[in-house]
């Protein structure tokens, strides 16, 4: 790290070290030899999240319902608002500036991981012995029916999209 002229939480102005403004406050005037740094609290719907020398506070993020957004955590003078997506939707980026509908897993695929407000549905192909016959954002691959346990036999083999079809056993007379 290069050397710094001031202490932590200070800044250099006109060869003078001045205190930075604390989070939640903005700079009104720099210190002088005889006066301290003057800071003012951020207004309603504004914030600053670091020790700073900003002359303007940042606006809280707006969670636009037209983009599928809603407030997850209300902002304070020291923190920004955190947005998330409405039920059934997820964020398109880490910043969560817009939302898209969770994708459904097509027949032949099941849900490996259900979507959250920040991640999409993760699908996986149904392996041998499992099937999914619906397009769903929640359904996992289901195991084929076990005909044997019902004292039945397989009449039609299952696929990744269909269950097996069971039927009665042929009885020898």
């Amino acid at each position: 790290e290069p050397p710094t002229a001031c202490r932590e939480k200070q800044y250099l102005i006109n060869s003078q070290c001045c205190s930075l403004c604390q989070p939640g406050q903005k700079l009104v005037s720099d210190c002088t030899e005889f006066t301290e740094t003057e800071c003012l609290p951020c207004g309603e719907s504004e914030f600053l999240d670091t020790w700073n020398r900003e002359t303007h506070c940042h606006q809280h993020k707006y969670c636009d319902p037209n983009l599928g957004l809603r407030v997850q955590q209300k902002g304070t003078s020291e923190t920004d608002t955190i947005c998330t997506c409405e039920e059934g939707w997820h964020c398109t980026s880490e910043a969560c500036e817009s939302c898209v509908l969770h994708r459904s897993c097509s027949p032949g695929f099941g849900v490996k991981q259900i979507a959250t407000g920040v991640s999409d549905t993760i699908c996986e192909p149904c392996p041998v012995g499992f099937f999914s016959n619906v397009s769903s954002a929640f359904e996992k691959c289901h195991p084929w029916t076990s005909c044997e346990t019902k004292d039945l036999v397989v009449q039609q083999a299952g696929t990744n999209k269909t269950d097996v079809v069971c039927g009665p056993q042929d009885r020898l007379r």
Epitope: E1, E8, Q10, Q16, C17, C18
Partner: antibody, heavy 126, light 107 residues
Framework: QVQLVQSGAEVKKPGASVKVSCKAS????????MHWVRQAPGQGLEWMGW????????NYAQKFQGRVTMTRDTSISTAYMELNRLRSDDTAVYYC???????????????????WGQGTLVTVSS | DIQMTQSPSSVSASIGDRVTVTCRAS??????VAWYQQKPGKVPKLLIY???KIQSGVPSRFSGSGSGTDFTLTISSLQPEDFATYYC?????????FGQGTLLEIK
């Protein structure tokens, strides 16, 4: 009462490293910057840098950049200064010195040293 | 870096004398100056900070003044225990810099 107790004298060969310790007592160790100042025989005082024991943040004089490392162990209220690649002109008494309280300074850097360690003589000689 | 130039580099004086040591900064530094006393083989002792504030426990015969670039340490009536080396130090910005020292000797 406030005390800064330093480790004992060291004799080192050129190119070696030395690590000096400074154990603080009688006050809240994490509440004050700790500085290191050295004094060559018959010479004046030379500032080397500081460590914030609370955050671990450091600031070194340009002259010592890349050769000095200041660390601390808050569990035993001790600050350390390690100087590498020693030369004969590093022969000096090394002092730790306590600064003003962390929240106290509003302009200037307020680095007035009210308490000093007893000093550690480091002799660099082949 | 801010240079601190002390004068004189040495001064001889007698008990009871008034002694003045000056320090000039290479740029304006407000009132961010300290003065230290150091006796041979001893640790520096803070006498004055913020140019004119006297450190707790320091005798009132020591005083400091000045702002901007010119600073003064005054000992109003020299006592036997005052014979030592005196250093000024700027605390305006890092790197901290000291004057080269003024040796106060018995005449």
């Amino acid at each position: 009462q406030v005390q800064l107790v330093q480790s004992g004298a060291e004799v080192k060969k050129p190119g070696a490293s030395v690590k000096v310790s400074c154990k603080a007592s009688g006050y809240t160790f994490t509440g004050y910057y700790m500085h290191w100042v050295r004094q060559a025989p018959g010479q004046g005082l030379e500032w080397m840098g500081w460590i914030n024991p609370d955050s671990g943040g450091t600031n070194y004089a340009q002259k010592f950049q890349g050769r000095v490392t200041m660390t601390r162990d808050t569990s035993i209220s001790t600050a350390y200064m390690e100087l590498n690649r020693l030369r004969s002109d590093d022969t000096a008494v090394y002092y730790c010195a306590r600064d003003q309280p962390l929240g106290y300074c509003t302009n200037g850097v307020c680095s007035y040293f009210d308490y000093w360690g007893q000093g550690t003589l480091v002799t660099v000689s082949s | 870096d801010i240079q601190m130039t002390q004068s004189p580099s040495s001064v001889s004086a007698s008990i009871g004398d008034r002694v003045t040591v000056t320090c000039r900064a290479s740029q304006a530094i407000g009132s961010w100056v300290a003065w230290y006393q150091q006796k041979p083989g001893k640790v520096p002792k803070l006498l004055i900070y913020s140019a004119s504030k006297i450190q707790s426990g320091v005798p009132s015969r020591f005083s400091g003044s000045g702002s901007g670039t010119d600073f003064t340490l005054t000992i109003s009536s020299l006592q036997p225990e005052d014979f030592a080396t005196y250093y000024c130090q700027q605390a305006n910005s890092f790197p901290i810099t000291f004057g080269q020292g003024t040796l106060l000797e018995i005449k």
